[in-house]
């Protein structure tokens, strides 16, 4: 009588997370009598996956009816595979013992690798807004994938970026992996409508990469340019002074008119005009009664944009002569962190 052999025909199998894994095992004899047990790993720390005779294993079903006469097929199916199930599985024949079963012979083992899809990439930008010409950092994270090999690319409006650094963790063997990448992006005034895209390609995605996006509208602050002009009106003693606030983003803006340094009126921007590039324009005017002034009047349009230090533009209104355009700038203050747009 030939001695029983335990045959595991598959050296390795690969299964997608969520699917079932079938681990094949046959024996060549009914003798010696005793159960088949399946283990993950070898040695004293091995994990029992299935015991033909003892215990309950809700995720495991046998491929064959083990109660059928002369059954020698002890293949099992493990349902709902996760990356944590990866490892080498051994089909082990035990000999009936008293009181305990005695290990008789083991199969060569089948390595189960689990293909797990990466999570949808999450792209996050800086906490504070930044102005054009500044460089900002974006991060992209994706988790839970296996195997470790993965490709990550960055794009800005469809153009691939090259200034980024990527890490895949952990460095050693693991049931699943995470990727973390940081890209540097230089902002331009035209970036309100721009998007930064992180693209992740993995064997589980069948050539259909996952993408995470960030809108630069949440990152950029475009400071306004100011222009103050005056127009005569029909009534000889009135002058209309307008302040054109152009090309700003986000919308949140407050404008104050000063007459000789004294606050004349404060208003919050509304009914804005949107430009093609996503920035906004706004205009405010002040009707000045010239006859009420004996001396020249200095009119200042002061704008506070998105919580930043005010910028202003002044216009000198000559009372003695006919009105004529005359202006002087005050230098804008340094850019500060913005609040969210209104």
């Amino acid at each position: 009588e030939e001695e029983l052999q335990v045959i595991q025909p598959d050296k390795s199998i690969s299964v997608a997370a969520g699917e079932s894994a079938t681990l094949h095992c046959t024996v060549t004899s009914l003798i010696p009598v005793g159960p088949i047990q399946w283990f993950r790993g070898a040695g004293p720390g091995r994990e029992l996956i299935y015991n033909q005779k003892e215990g309950h294993f809700p995720r495991v079903t046998t491929v064959s009816d083990l109660t059928k006469r002369n059954n020698m097929d002890f293949s099992i199916r493990i349902s709902n595979i996760t990356p944590a199930d990866a490892g080498t599985y051994y089909c082990v024949k035990f000999r009936k013992g008293s009181p305990d079963h005695v290990e008789f012979k083991s199969g060569a083992g089948t390595e189960l690798s689990v293909r797990a899809k990466p999570s949808a990439p999450v792209v996050s930008g800086p906490a504070a807004r930044a102005t054009p010409q500044h460089t900002v950092s974006f991060t992209c994270e994706s988790h839970g994938f296996s195997p470790r090999d993965i490709t990550l690319k960055w794009f800005k409006n469809g153009n691939e970026l090259s200034d980024f650094q990527t890490n895949v963790d952990p460095a050693g063997d693991s049931v699943s992996y995470s990727i973390h990448s940081t890209a540097k992006v230089v902002l331009t005034r035209e970036d309100v409508h721009s998007q930064v895209i992180c693209e992740v390609a993995h064997v589980t995605l069948q050539g259909d990469p996952l993408r995470g996006t960030a809108n630069l509208s949440e990152t950029i602050r475009v400071p306004p340019t100011l222009e103050v002009t005056q127009q005569p009106v029909r009534a000889e003693n009135q002058v209309n002074v307008t302040c054109q606030v152009r090309k700003f983003y986000p919308q949140r803006l407050q404008l104050t008119w000063l007459e000789n340094g004294n606050v004349s009126r404060t208003e919050t921007a509304s009914t804005l005009t949107e430009n093609k590039d996503g920035t906004y324009n706004w205009m405010s005017w002040l009707l000045v009664n010239v006859s009420a002034h004996r001396d020249d009047v200095k009119l200042t349009c002061q704008v506070e944009h998105d919580g930043q230090p005010a910028v202003s533009k002044s216009h000198d209104l000559k009372v003695s002569a006919h009105p004529k355009e005359q202006g002087s700038n005050t230098a804008p203050g340094p850019a500060l962190a913005s609040a969210a747009p209104l």
Epitope: L30, I31, V33, Q52, K53, E54, G55, H56, D65, L66, T67, K68, R69, N70, K96
Partner: antibody, heavy 121, light 111 residues
Framework: EVKLEESGGGLMQPGGSMKLSCVAS????????MNWVRQSPEKGLEWVAE??????????HYAESVKGRFTISRDDSKSSVYLQMNNLRAEDTGIYYC????????????WGQGTTLTVSS | DIVLTQSPASLAVSLGQRATISCRAS??????????MYWYQQKPGQPPKLLIY???NLESGVPARFSGSGSGTDFTLNIHPVEEEDAATYYC?????????FGGGTKLEIK
């Protein structure tokens, strides 16, 4: 340690009914086929009934001499097997053993101590 | 039903000698190369105890002086050397098909 303990035997009149019980311990009861075998001086050892697993839809098999009168059942949650005996006859007298079938092949590796049924008027 | 006929009905064997018990089936109990025959030992007041499975394989915990052989319809249980504690009744049982049946028993006496 595997243990099988029968109960429910006694003296019955012909035509009467009786239910034998067997409580198992020391093994995963739900993974084993269970059997009843009886023994009498007249007939020797006589296999009576078998009940298989949930995965076998609790299939049952009976000796011709008890078919239609005896019913084997099991309650895996209580690790128990039962033998309901109706329309008892004098020839049903004997020691009734509860048995574990180790390898789904009438491999009777563990027997209880038995419970005695006497059918007599 | 498959009928199992045991012989002899009883035998007396001297201590240390060989005891041979035969079991003949009315029909083959062998399929796919396996012989579905079992042997049991029963002592007074106790349930039967499994000795041999599938005709020739020793059940765990059973002394090696017990051995089984045979195929098809003819099977043998051997005990050698016989010891005093082997005094008992021995039964063969088949599982070739339903219903399972037992032999009539062989009573072994030690001289």
């Amino acid at each position: 340690e595997v243990k099988l303990e029968e109960s429910g035997g006694g003296l019955m009149q012909p035509g009467g009914s009786m239910k034998l019980s067997c409580v198992a311990s020391g093994f995963t009861f739900s993974n084993y086929w269970m059997n009843w075998v009886r023994q009498s001086p007249e007939k020797g050892l006589e296999w009576v009934a078998e009940i298989r697993l949930k995965s076998n839809n609790y299939a049952t098999h009976y000796a011709e001499s008890v078919k239609g009168r005896f019913t084997i059942s099991r309650d895996d949650s209580k690790s128990s097997v039962y033998l309901q005996m109706n329309n008892l006859r004098a020839e049903d007298t004997g020691i009734y053993y509860c048995i574990r079938d180790y390898d789904y092949d009438a491999y009777f590796d563990y027997w209880g101590q038995g419970t005695t049924l006497t059918v007599s008027s | 039903d498959i009928v199992l006929t045991q012989s002899p009905a009883s035998l007396a064997v001297s201590l240390g000698q060989r005891a041979t018990i035969s079991c003949r089936a009315s029909k083959s109990v062998s399929t796919s190369g396996y012989n579905y025959m079992y042997w049991y030992q029963q002592k007074p007041g106790q349930p039967p105890k499994l000795l041999i499975y599938l005709a020739s394989n020793l059940e765990s915990g059973v002394p090696a002086r017990f051995s089984g052989s045979g195929s098809g319809t003819d099977f043998t249980l051997n005990i050698h050397p016989v010891e005093e504690e082997d005094a008992a009744t021995y039964y063969c049982q088949h599982s070739g098909e339903l219903p399972y049946t037992f032999g009539g028993g062989t009573k072994l006496e030690i001289k």
